[in-house]
Amino acid sequence: LIIGFGISGRHSITVTTVASAGNIGEDGILSCTFEPDIKLSDIVIQWLKEGVLGLVHEFKEGKDELSEQDEMFRGRTAVFADQVIVGNASLRLKNVQLTDAGTYKCYIITSKGKGNANLEYKTGAFSMPEVNVDYNASSETLRCEAPRWFPQPTVVWASQVDQGANFSEVSNTSFELNSENVTMKVVSVLYNVTINNTYSCMIENDIAKATGDIKVTESEIKRRSHLQLLNSKAS
């Protein structure tokens, strides 16, 4: 969480941002909130990006003002106009690109004063893994697949029964470049698995950590997966 204060002759206002990560090809949100004003026409929101000449987005006098918008953001940004009055200056970003990563500044002017806060935005690719029993294999084998990751992640297997065991000798992980030549499909195979055990396939890069669990018994197979973004800090 980053909290910024204004430093002008006017009173300063508190502006709060949250560091976040964008998934390439998906839409992203750059979060920013501020002390609200009672008049929409008195609020100015400017989003800027370090190293970029034009503005990312500007909203003032109750409407978007994009005449100074940088080319890399054209047609890709929007504020939640109906939520500006309650202090939400968050920015929606369409079709996140690797090059959108960087330091952004959310700069606010209201009748109460000015304030700003920076936001670190990371970009990459992350997806939920799915673990299945590979019935085509000669021995009991598990296959963990996740369709889109970038940068290249690490894959670690764990088991509930053999806690702390190192499965690197009995697993094989491959990375296959997807058609857009950036993200990769992750496939990891674990051999010699035993019945009545829960196995976890953990995929992690510097942006996200995802886990796919599978519990294999003689009567059923249960699956569960979850994904967590790393380094979501507020400012």
Epitope: G25, D64, L66, Q69, D70, E71, G75, K94
Partner: antibody, heavy 119, light 107 residues
Framework: QIQLQESGPGLVQPSQSLSITCTVS????????VQWVRQSPGKGLEWLGV???????DYNAAFISRLSISKDNSKSQVFFKMNSLQADDTAIYYC?????????????WGQGTLVTVSA | NIVMTQSPKSMSMSVGERVTLRCKAS??????VSWYQQKPEQSPKLLIY???NRYTGVPDRFTGSGSATDFTLTISSVQAEDLADYHC?????????FGSGTKLEIK
């Protein structure tokens, strides 16, 4: 009330150029981009290009060599010019505006101007 | 270029029937698909944007769904005034592209 209105020549000689003006009201050209789309007789819609609030443009690669879009913010007018027209450029030409500043649907359309390319 | 393939090309339905129009993108377009209704001699009108968001004033019998490559426009109970051409379009990547349209006729 948001409105867009095209005005064009109707008839264009083969190999000549086409100029259409789109006059908008109810919104500012510094807030929203304006898209251009055409529809040939009995055919589907074809996206031609866009001019953004900043004045920068994006064109359909199939038309980039003969298409130019410009605007005058103060007059709320967008200018569309296409060169070297042939018979298969006969179509209704529309200007349109997106629903938001992110392109996710063309919510407002002009009435369209029918352009016939014929000697 | 992303190709948007619409099906069927045309269909004839009775008032009150349920209509399903399909649009398939040649590659992933996330949810950046919109649906338009075009009546004879009129400009297209936006029905659905963002794959599933009904535009202001559009009757709730029109519903959009889908993501990535497969999209559907459903008219739950077709009315006589729904006689029109229906177009899908993608605005995920340049050049923006449209399907060739579905002509809906009322029996």
């Amino acid at each position: 009330q948001i409105q867009l209105q095209e005005s064009g020549p109707g008839l264009v000689q083969p190999s000549q150029s086409l100029s259409i003006t789109c006059t908008v009201s109810g919104f500012s050209l510094t807030s929203y981009g304006v898209q251009w789309v055409r529809q040939s007789p009995g055919k589907g819609l074809e996206w031609l290009g866009v001019i953004w609030s900043s004045g920068s443009t994006d064109y359909n690669a199939a038309f980039i060599s003969r298409l130019s879009i410009s605007k005058d913010n103060s007059k709320s007018q967008v200018f569309f010019k296409m060169n070297s027209l042939q018979a298969d450029d006969t179509a209704i030409y529309y200007c349109a505006r997106d629903i938001t500043t992110i392109v996710e649907g063309f919510a407002y359309w002009g009435q369209g101007t029918l352009v016939t390319v014929s000697a | 270029n992303i190709v948007m393939t619409q099906s069927p090309k045309s269909m004839s339905m009775s008032v009150g029937e349920r209509v399903t129009l399909r649009c398939k993108a040649s590659e992933n377009v996330n949810t950046y698909v919109s649906w338009y209704q075009q009546k004879p001699e009129q400009s297209p009108k936006l029905l659905i944007y963002g794959a599933s968001n009904r535009y202001t004033g559009v009757p709730d019998r029109f519903t959009g769904s889908g993501s990535a490559t497969d999209f559907t426009l459903t008219i739950s109970s077709v009315q006589a005034e729904d006689l029109a051409d229906y177009h899908c379009g993608q605005s995920y990547s340049y050049p923006f592209t449209f399907g060739s349209g579905t002509k809906l006729e009322i029996k």
